[in-house]
């Protein structure tokens, strides 16, 4: 396997705590935003087949040595890279070894199979925000706030591949109350579990909760986009959400196919193929320029699935910000 990355402490070489090499020193990776796309790249790099999970690195024995440093705060892969080194990485600024990232791949030499995902965030804007619901015996149940914690939210976000937990224990709006049976309360997750179902809890269905105590969780949505500055939601300067920050997209290589994917993703019909002059009427953006050299086939359902340079890498100014006009 490559000298720059390895998995340590697992049952086989394709699972364990993630360790990377920097300047001849092996260290760990913080699990901030660590998700299934990052694991997919790691598994590919190690020749370990498909990704099957994002367990906490602390599960693997022996634990990281005290002198071993957390070297990377976060890794953000699109999932198409060949190595972790090609993904955007953030230098460590605050992370403990109990937040070490872990990974499990479908070891080609074993019959290891992934645990099916039996959790969802319902009635929210996108699959990374919403009311927590858990599947048990083919039935979806809500989860009571009693005993719910940040650690439990962290498990849910990791299980869904939604990055870090950014909000928990918020009451659901009335329109987002559950109508399903209440599954359980008194969740006591350590935060290290691979799935919410692995957390100890009170007995199934036995609680005194009401639906106004349903738990709402918001995770850092891995990707979102919007059109700003137009007179409706279907026209304007394109902005994408990455790491919780909105940024613009450079127009290098941008064309009709890319327009179509954006309009499709936003549910805004077809692109009106605006002229260069029409595109410029929304003005330049400010802040980050997140994407450059975006290449779509036109078949993608999301701009996230298109090829592009690594997040934040570009040779553009805001004068080159992309604007899109859809039929609405």
């Amino acid at each position: 396997s490559p000298s720059g990355v390895r998995l340590v402490g697992g049952l086989h070489r394709c699972e364990g705590r993630v360790e990377v090499e920097q300047k001849g020193q092996w260290g760990t990776v913080c699990d901030d935003g660590w998700d299934i796309k990052d694991v997919a790249v790691l598994c590919r790099e190690l020749g370990c087949g498909a990704a099957s999970g994002t367990p906490s690195g602390i599960l693997y024995e022996p634990p990281a040595e005290k002198e071993q440093k957390v070297l990377i705060q976060s890794v953000s892969c699109t999932g198409t890279e060949d190595t972790l080194a090609q993904c955007e990485q953030e230098e460590v600024y605050d992370c403990s070894h109990d937040e070490d990232a872990g990974a499990s791949c479908e070891n080609p030499e074993s019959s290891f199979s992934p645990v099916p995902e039996g959790v969802r965030l319902a009635d929210g804007p996108g699959h990374c925000k919403g009311r927590v619901e858990v599947k048990h015996q083919n039935q979806w149940y809500t989860v009571c706030q009693t005993g719910w914690s940040l650690r439990a939210a962290k498990v849910v976000c990791r299980q869904l591949g939604c990055g870090r937990a950014v909000l928990t224990q918020k009451r659901c709006n009335k329109h987002a109350y559950g109508r399903k049976p209440i599954w359980l309360s008194q969740m006591s997750c350590s935060g290290r579990e691979a799935t919410l179902q692995d957390c100890p809890s009170g007995p199934w269905g036995k609680n005194t909760c009401n639906h106004d105590e349903d738990t709402w969780v918001e995770c850092e949505d891995p990707f979102d986009l919007r059109l700003v500055g137009g007179d409706n939601l279907c026209s304007g300067r394109l902005e994408v959400l990455h790491k919780g920050v909105w940024g613009s997209v450079c127009d290098d290589n941008w064309g009709e196919k890319e327009d179509q994917v954006v309009c499709k993703q936003l549910g805004c019909g077809k692109s009106l193929s605006p002229s260069f002059r029409d595109r410029k009427c929304y003005g330049p953006g400010v802040g980050r320029i997140w994407l450059d050299n975006v290449r779509c086939s036109g078949e993608e359902q999301s701009l996230e699935q298109c090829q592009h340079r690594f997040w934040g890498f570009h040779d553009c100014t805001h004068q080159e910000d992309v604007a899109v006009i859809c039929s609405g």
Partner: antibody, heavy 121, light 109 residues
């Protein structure tokens, strides 16, 4: 371990000034250093930082006029240009905790006593 | 740019009382928040880091809590020596800076 700021002075509007933060008992190779200022009777105001890797970040109002750099393994400087009355303040440098048993702590647990910069004609 | 909003701007409580200070971040900063105490003519002193971890040597009367965007510092059994200005500070992310709240002046009667 300690840090100490120096270079504070009385200067005229439009002048430039460089402040120095000197470490004692450690070096800056594994820590992030932050500059903060406090105008008389006012709150703490973040200026910017330089990380152990040399990456810098500035508050939006400080970009262009303030520059943070590492000159030696034990000194960090803050260069200030086009000073105005509004820059009159005590300037602090602070060090983050850095690595402890392999974990990295980003809280600022070590502060200097501060150095006073007065801008007045 | 990240904004930290601290409330109240001042608080006055008797000896033995309790003061609660709140800090709200304009976007999630997970648990990367510190609380400082500052007395006139002195640099800030770290009380709490990672939102709820007590700094070594700091009295357990100081308690921090919160995650994401909402944080609280509670000072119980107030003593005269607690009279000071208290600040929250975010230290999240390499691109977010290390922003302070506006401060809370605590008077102990």
């Amino acid at each position: 371990q300690s840090v100490k700021e120096s270079g504070g002075d009385l200067v005229k509007p439009g002048a430039s000034l460089t402040l120095t933060c000197t470490a004692s008992g450690f070096d800056f190779s594994s820590n992030t250093m932050c500059w903060v200022r406090q105008a008389p009777g006012k709150g703490l105001e973040y200026i910017g930082y330089i990380s152990y890797s040399g990456a810098t970040h500035y508050a939006s109002w400080a970009k262009g006029r303030f520059t943070i750099s590492k000159t030696l393994s034990t000194t960090v400087t803050l260069q200030m240009t086009s000073l105005t009355d509004a820059d009159t303040a005590t300037y602090f440098c602070a060090r983050d905790r850095g690595y402890v048993d392999g974990s990295y702590y980003g809280d600022f647990n070590l502060w200097g006593p501060g150095t006073l910069v007065t801008v007045s004609s | 740019e990240l904004v930290m909003t601290q409330t109240p701007s001042s608080a006055s409580e008797p000896v033995g009382g309790t003061v609660t200070i709140k800090c709200q971040a304009s976007q999630s900063i997970a648990s990367r928040l510190a609380w400082f105490q500052q007395k006139p003519g002195q640099p800030p002193k770290l009380l709490i880091y990672r939102a709820s971890t007590l700094e070594s040597g700091v009295s357990s009367r100081f308690k921090g809590s919160g995650f994401g965007t909402e944080f609280t510092l509670t000072i119980s059994d107030l003593e005269c020596a607690d009279a000071a200005t208290y600040y929250c500070q975010s230290y999240y992310g390499s691109g977010y800076g290390k922003t302070f709240g506006g401060g809370t002046d605590v008077v102990v009667k």
